[in-house]
């Protein structure tokens, strides 16, 4: 007996779609083996029509697909635009068509119901608008126009030209009679309900000379689109509800076990706390379409999602909706990385961001999630080196360790840096991830002087004290610029007095600038790392002044306010600054921080045993 199971009998009507689900035991072998849908011929052979390996027969091209859901032990065959010719005997199965792991399915496609001659068929999704056209002859032009709904043997008046409106259609129906010469009237029904489904009759005039036209209205509930995304990854729901609701509040909701729909996010400012820090509703286009991005996908995010429009910002019958069934794959290609990173005030964090390793050349970005209104994510830094001005000297995006991970370092932390940040690229949008930075009690581990003023032409020595726990780490100094942090030669000077509770393993590493030049002004970072994995950093600003010049003063690196026109994450497509960005419509314009001098320019340092490999500037 085959362990594969499905529907023995499937029936539908011409023009419709079917979605055939076949179930199998989700063993490791079964989950990964080929899935197929084939048609049994007279000879007994079963000819493949569609398979999980991407094959689609010419007869099914553009109207069928097969999707495997390995964790659920299910695969789904969708077939659209059915015709009578599709009736027959089929098999859904695993492995090779001629072997036993299969299930017999009989598909019967019948003609739609018999309709009166000349009936016009209108097929419309629930919540949308239909316009029923009703022709008439000249002699009936001045007479009453009406639309009836046929219910069994009776006809119920829906609307007429004497201003009658059936209560079931109140506020959503209108009858339009054109000017002279046009021998057609129209009935427009908005916000269609499933109960509007049925046969209608247009009538102009009365008696034996009346004009009649039948209309068959088919109101369809949207079939959920299958969405299969990886755990920890990202999903984007694109929602296009039509111009009729362009100016109405929009929402995304998730269907619960009671079959009601809980708002996940809406344009009225409501957001489910379970999605805090990992959801954005992107501003709608002129046509009323919008999209919702959810990152950091969890198993519990699975379910049926609906997007819609209604002035209350939640699901109401008779308003347009779109549906998705989201599955979250636990066998994720997206590596585990910390979802929370903790740092202390004055200290630093190093965040590891995953990206699709097949896209090593993609641009990398880091943005700060802001929850106000629909959520937004202004970019703070990108791999090409643009950094928001207020993060100058304390934020850097490094290509290391590479091969599917980049690093973002943020130092000089304050409580205001606590929040949610997104890692993203201009490539595969499913790899967007979220990390929360928390600021906890404690002292920074690395100790450097406060801001330093150096004298032109003289020698400057900057010490960086590190505790014994970092004794096995590589220490480095680097000069920060908006394109990275260029490693400088530094000198390990032995024991440090800064950590009284440590033995001789508590050391300091010094940076010497000799002689100091104008180009040496800027931010310097002291840091520790293990191979390509970065640890803590501490930052010092070096101001350079003339030797003994009266009236000279210390130059403070003022933290600029946020640029008003910063780049902001959304989920579409746009070009910025002549750089093609594939999925961002990502971004609007942004001010660019000017490069703060040549990297390492002018530093003539004492060289000791510490590494001088370049940090962050190039991809290893």
């Amino acid at each position: 007996k085959s362990p594969v199971f499905g529907p023995q009998e499937v029936s539908s009507v011409e023009g419709n779609s079917v979605s055939i689900k076949c179930y199998y035991p989700p063993t490791s072998v079964n989950r990964h083996t080929r899935k197929y849908w084939c048609r049994k011929g007279a000879s007994g052979r079963c000819i493949t029509l569609v398979s999980s390996e991407g094959y689609v027969s010419s007869n099914y091209a553009g109207r069928a697909n097969l999707t495997n859901f390995p964790e659920n032990g299910t695969f789904v065959v969708n077939i659209a635009q059915l015709s009578r010719d599709d009736s027959g005997h089929y098999k859904c199965g695993l492995g090779i068509n001629s072997r036993g792991l299969s299930f017999d399915v009989s598909l019967e496609v019948s003609q739609g119901p018999e309709l009166p001659n000349g009936t016009e068929v209108y097929t419309v999704d629930v919540g949308r608008t239909v316009t029923i056209k009703c022709p008439f002859k000249t002699e009936n032009a001045p007479k009453t126009k009406a639309l009836y709904k046929k219910i069994g043997q009776t006809s119920v008046l829906v609307i007429d030209s004497r201003n009658y409106v059936n209560p079931n259609y109140k506020d959503r129906i209108r009858l339009r009679i054109p000017g002279t010469g046009q021998l057609i009237f129209t009935v427009v029904i908005d916000r269609l309900r499933l109960s509007d489904h049925g046969l209608y009759l247009c009538q102009a005039g009365d008696g034996s000379n009346r004009d009649e036209k039948n209309a068959d209205l088919q109101v369809l509930e949207p079939e959920p689109e299958l969405v299969y995304e990886d755990l920890r990854g990202s999903v984007t729901f694109h929602c296009a509800l039509g111009l009729e609701v362009a100016n109405v509040a929009k929402f995304l909701c998730r269907v619960n076990s009671r079959e009601t729909c809980d708002v996940v996010i809406n344009t009225l400012g409501k957001r489910d706390s379970a999605f805090e820090g990992r959801i954005l509703l992107n501003p709608q286009d002129k046509d009323g379409s919008f999209s919702v991005v959810i990152t950091g996908l969890r198993k519990e995010d699975e379910g049926r999602y609906l997007c819609g429009a209604h002035s209350d910002g939640q699901l109401q019958e008779g308003w347009p909706i779109q549906a998705w069934q989201l599955f979250v794959n636990e066998e994720s290609t997206i590596p585990r990385s910390p979802t929370v990173v903790k740092g202390v005030a004055g200290g630093s964090v190093a965040v590891l961001c995953p990206y699709n390793p097949k896209e090593s050349q993609s641009l990398k970005y880091w943005c700060l999630w802001e929850g106000a209104q629909n959520g937004r994510c202004p970019l703070l830094v990108e791999s090409q080196g643009l950094v928001q001005e207020q993060y100058e000297g304390r934020l850097s995006l490094l290509q290391e360790p590479g091969n599917g991970t980049f690093t973002v370092i943020l130092n000089q932390l304050t409580t205001q840096d606590a929040g949610f940040y997104w890692c993203l690229t201009n490539g595969d949008t499913r790899w967007r991830t979220t990390v929360e930075i928390k600021i906890i009690e404690g002292e920074p581990n690395l100790k450097v002087p406060g801001n330093v003023t150096a004298v032109l032409g003289e020698t400057l020595n900057i010490p960086c004290h590190f505790p014994c726990k970092f004794s096995s780490y590589e220490k480095y100094w680097c000069k920060w610029s908006n394109t990275g942090c260029q490693t400088l030669p530094s000198q390990d000077e032995g024991p440090s007095e800064a950590f009284v509770n440590c033995d001789e393993n508590s050391r300091l590493v010094s940076l010497t600038l000799n002689p100091v030049t104008r180009a040496d002004e800027g931010w310097y970072w002291c840091g520790v790392k293990q191979g390509h994995f970065y640890g803590e950093t501490a930052a010092v600003y070096v101001a350079v002044e003339e030797k003994k010049v009266a009236g000279s003063r210390y130059v403070s690196p003022a933290k600029a306010d946020a640029a008003p026109d910063e780049k902001v994450l959304d989920s579409g497509v746009r070009e910025i600054e002549n750089k093609a960005i594939q999925d961002p419509r990502l971004f609007a314009e942004e001010k660019v921080v000017a490069d703060t001098g040549d990297q390492a320019g002018g530093s003539r340092a004492s060289v000791d045993s510490s590494s001088s490999e370049e940090q962050g500037g190039s991809s290893k």
Partner: nanobody
Framework: QVQLVESGGGLVQPGGSLRLSCAAS????????MGWFRQAPGKEREFVTA??????????YYADSVKGRFTISRDNARNTVYLQMNSLKPEDTAVYYC?????????????????WGQGTLVTVSS
């Protein structure tokens, strides 16, 4: 909430026929699958048949033990599902339960349906 009421059970001779009905009321518009399960004395509840629908397409599922003998059907207007049982055997004796499910995704053989009826007894005996 959805209420399910079964009817049509009774005593029948081997080889005979019986038709069970399951009438649904309440929030029936959210139902996408209705199934029949049975439980013989001292045994676990087992799947018999199910019907699933979406738009004007329907999908019928049968357990191997009843394939070719039992037929499931649905009257949309009456919110009722029928189970036509032919060629009945003594081993078909059980309490037959009607069940309703909201999900189009769950395996219809699993017993994690959202709503259940009280059951109707079918006895096949000479």
């Amino acid at each position: 909430q959805v209420q399910l009421v079964e009817s049509g059970g009774g005593l029948v001779q081997p080889g005979g026929s019986l038709r069970l009905s399951c009438a649904a009321s309440g929030r029936t518009s959210s139902i996408s699958t209705m199934g029949w399960f049975r439980q013989a004395p001292g045994k676990e509840r087992e799947f018999v048949t199910a019907i699933r629908w979406s738009g004007s397409s329907s999908y019928k599922y049968y357990a191997d033990s009843v394939k070719g003998r039992f037929t499931i059907s649905r009257d949309n207007a009456r919110n009722t599902v029928y189970l036509q049982m032919n060629s009945l055997k003594p081993e078909d004796t059980a309490v037959y339960y009607c069940a309703a499910q909201m999900s189009l995704w769950r395996d219809p053989r699993e017993i994690d349906y959202d709503y259940w009826g009280q059951g109707t007894l079918v006895t096949v005996s000479s």
